[in-house]
Interface confidence: medium
C-alpha cells in the first residue's frame, strides 16, 4: 500500500486518540454491585485522555469502535475460596443511557482468582460503562492486579 | 467527525508504529525469575519494529502509551500440578531504569496452566520491561502458548 | 515528537482501519472442530470493516500486523464439568492457504469455563483464520461471553 498518494489527508486531532486506563477506587454500598474507578497521573499509572469519570463510572466522549479491556483480581483469594464463593461474576456493560443498556463482556471466576479479557465494541458519545462484580468476594485494589481501560480504534 | 478540515497534518513517521511480539527463548538461571525473550522473522511469527531486545528483555524506544499483553502457559502442567505448585505468579514490570521500577501487571496461575492479560500503560524511551515467573514450574516454549508483546497506542 | 514537520502525509484510506468483531453462529458437524462465526449490525454489536466471512471463517483483506483476540465461554459448565471433560482446548490459527497454515494462539480450559487471550501477528490478504474447539463441551452463544475479533495495527 502506498502512503503518500491519496488526496485526503488525516489531521492529528481527528485521529481520536481517546484512551483511558483506570484503577479501582472502591466498591459500591451493599446493594450496588458496581466497581468505582479512578484515574489520573497523581494516582500512579492511570489516566484519562478524552473519556471522563462520572461518579466513578467511565463516560465516553467520542463515537467510534473501542477496545475495552479489564482485569480484576479478588483479594484474599485462593482457588478453594473462589470455588466456595462461586458464582463470582464480572460484567462490563453500557449502563446509561438506559436506551443503550447492554452487557458487553462477562466472565465468572470459577476456581480462579483473576479474570482478564478484552473486546472490540462500538460506543457512542455519552455512553457510560459500568463494571458489575456480583458475589461476596472483594476485589484487590493493587494497581497491577485490577484495572479497566478503553482505547479508541476507529470511527 | 470530518477528516479533511484541520490544518495540522500527521506525517507517517510520527504515527510511531512501534510494536513488538516476542517468543520465549529460555528461563533464567537458578535465582533469576526473569523470562528471556527473542524475536525476529527467522524465528517464526515474532518481530520487533521499534523496540529492541537487551539481553532477552524488551527495551522501549519511543515515549507513549502502550498496550502491553502477555500469555504464559506452564509446561508439564495439569490443574492438579498447578495447584500443588501454587503459588506460581507472573509479573510484568519496568525493571530499569531503577528509578522507574514498578510492577505493571500481575497474575497467579492457581488451578490453571495459562494466564493471559493486557493493559494500557505509559512507557518512556529507555524503559526495559521484565517478565518474572516465580515458582517451580517451567513455561512452555511453544510459540502459540507463550508470547509477550507491546503496541504503541498514542503519544 | 513534532507532528507537523515531515513532508510525507498519511491519507485516511491507507490507515487501513480493518477491524472485525464476530459472535458465535454455530459449531461444526461431528468431525469438524471449527467454530462458525457471524457478524453485522443486524446481529447486535458485531461488525466487519474490511475482513470478510467465508463460510463462517474470517478472511483477511489487508496485509499487516493484527491484534487478534478471542473469548470463549463453555455452556452449561462448572469447574467440575470442565475438569471432568478435560482436555477442552481452543486454538486460533491460519487454516488457509494451506502453505501458511499455523497455530497462532492456544489455550486449554483446565478447571475454568472461559478462556480469553490476544496476540499480535502478521497476516496477509487471503489468510483465513479458524478457531478450533476440541473436546465434548459446547460453547455459549451469548454475545458477551463468546466473541472473536481482529484489529489492523500497522503495515
Amino acid at each position: 500500500q502506498r502512503f503518500a498518494q491519496a488526496q485526503q489527508q488525516l489531521p492529528l486531532e481527528s485521529l481520536g486518540w481517546d484512551v483511558a486506563e483506570l484503577q479501582l477506587n472502591h466498591t459500591g454500598p451493599q446493594q450496588d454491585p458496581r466497581l468505582y474507578w479512578q484515574g489520573g497521573p497523581a494516582l500512579g499509572r492511570s489516566f484519562l485522555h478524552g473519556p471522563e469519570l462520572d461518579k466513578g463510572q467511565l463516560r465516553i466522549h467520542r463515537d467510534g469502535i473501542y477496545m475495552v479491556h479489564i482485569q480484576v483480581t479478588l483479594a484474599i483469594c485462593s482457588s478453594t475460596t473462589a470455588s466456595r464463593h462461586h458464582p463470582t461474576t464480572l460484567a462490563v456493560g453500557i449502563c446509561s443511557p438506559a436506551s443503550r443498556s447492554i452487557s458487553l463482556l462477562r466472565l465468572s471466576f470459577h476456581q480462579g482468582c483473576t479474570i482478564a479479557s478484552q473486546r472490540l465494541t462500538p460506543l457512542a458519545r455519552g455512553d457510560t460503562l459500568c463494571t458489575n462484580l456480583t458475589g461476596t468476594l472483594l476485589p484487590s485494589r493493587n494497581t497491577d492486579e485490577t484495572f479497566f481501560g478503553v482505547q479508541w480504534v476507529r470511527p | 467527525q470530518r477528516f479533511a478540515q484541520a490544518q495540522q497534518q500527521l506525517p507517517l513517521e510520527s504515527l510511531g508504529w512501534d510494536v513488538a511480539e516476542l517468543q520465549l527463548n529460555h528461563t533464567g538461571p537458578q535465582q533469576d525469575p526473569r523470562l528471556y525473550w527473542q524475536g525476529g522473522p527467522a524465528l517464526g511469527r515474532s518481530f520487533l519494529h521499534g523496540p529492541e531486545l537487551d539481553k532477552g528483555q524488551l527495551r522501549i524506544h519511543r515515549d507513549g502509551i502502550y498496550m502491553v499483553h502477555i500469555q504464559v502457559t506452564l509446561a508439564i502442567c495439569s490443574s492438579t500440578t498447578a495447584s500443588r505448585h501454587h503459588p506460581t505468579t507472573l509479573a510484568v514490570g519496568i525493571c530499569s531504569p531503577a528509578s522507574r521500577s514498578i510492577s505493571l501487571l500481575r497474575l497467579s496461575f492457581h488451578q490453571g496452566c495459562t494466564i493471559a492479560s493486557q493493559r494500557l500503560t505509559p512507557l518512556a524511551r529507555g524503559d526495559t520491561l521484565c517478565t518474572n515467573l516465580t515458582g517451580t514450574l517451567l513455561p512452555s516454549r511453544n510459540t502459540d502458548e507463550t508470547f509477550f508483546g507491546v503496541q504503541w497506542v498514542r503519544p | 515528537q513534532r507532528f507537523a514537520q515531515a513532508q510525507q502525509q498519511l491519507p485516511l484510506e491507507s490507515l487501513g482501519w480493518d477491524v472485525a468483531e464476530l459472535q458465535l453462529n454455530h459449531t461444526g458437524p461431528q468431525q469438524d472442530p471449527r467454530l462458525y462465526w457471524q457478524g453485522g449490525p443486524a446481529l447486535g454489536r458485531s461488525f466487519l470493516h474490511g475482513p470478510e466471512l467465508d463460510k463462517g471463517q474470517l478472511r483477511i483483506h489487508r496485509d499487516g500486523i493484527y491484534m487478534v483476540h478471542i473469548q470463549v465461554t463453555l455452556a452449561i459448565c462448572s469447574s467440575t464439568t470442565a475438569s471432568r471433560h478435560h482436555p477442552t482446548t481452543l486454538a486460533v490459527g491460519i487454516c488457509s492457504p494451506a502453505s501458511r497454515s499455523i497455530s497462532l494462539l492456544r489455550l486449554s480450559f483446565h478447571q475454568g469455563c472461559t478462556i480469553a487471550s490476544q496476540r499480535l501477528t502478521p497476516l496477509a490478504r487471503g489468510d483465513t483464520l479458524c478457531t478450533n474447539l476440541t473436546g465434548t463441551l459446547l460453547p455459549s452463544r451469548n454475545t458477551d461471553e463468546t466473541f472473536f475479533g481482529v484489529q489492523w495495527v500497522r503495515p
Epitope: - | 506452564l74 508439564i76 517451567l138 512452555s140 502458548e145 | 482436555p87 486449554s108
Partner: nanobody, 121 residues
Framework: EVQLLESGGGLVQPGGSLRLSCAAS????????MGWVRQAPGKGLEWVSS????????YYADSVKGRFTISRDNSKNTLYLQMNSLRAEDTAVYYC??????????????WGQGTLVTVSS
Amino acid sequence: EVQLLESGGGLVQPGGSLRLSCAASGFTFSSEAMGWVRQAPGKGLEWVSSINGSGRNTYYADSVKGRFTISRDNSKNTLYLQMNSLRAEDTAVYYCARKHGEYYDSGYDVWGQGTLVTVSS
C-alpha cells in the same frame, strides 16, 4: 473418553532394564505428540522424553540420554519407554502424557495415572 494407561513399572536392581507401556484411547493417537514425565519422591515433575506423531522425531532429557529410548506403535495406540542401565536416581512415578507440541517442554493436556519404578539393590 480420552484415556492413558501406563504399565510395566516395578522393582529393579541398579544397572537393570524395564520397558514401560502406555495404552491410549479416545483420540487419534497417530496425530498427537506424546511424552514421558516422572516425579521422584518429594520432587517436582521432570520431563523425560517425547516423540512426535509419526515417531520420526524423538527428544530426551540430558539425564536419560543414551540410556532410555522412546518409541510408539500407532497401529496399537501404544507408547513405550525402554529404560536401560537404570540408576537409583531414576526411581520415580512415570507418567505418560499427551503433548501440545513437539518442543521438549511444551504443555501436556492428558495424563495417565502413573506407574512406579523403583531402582534399588
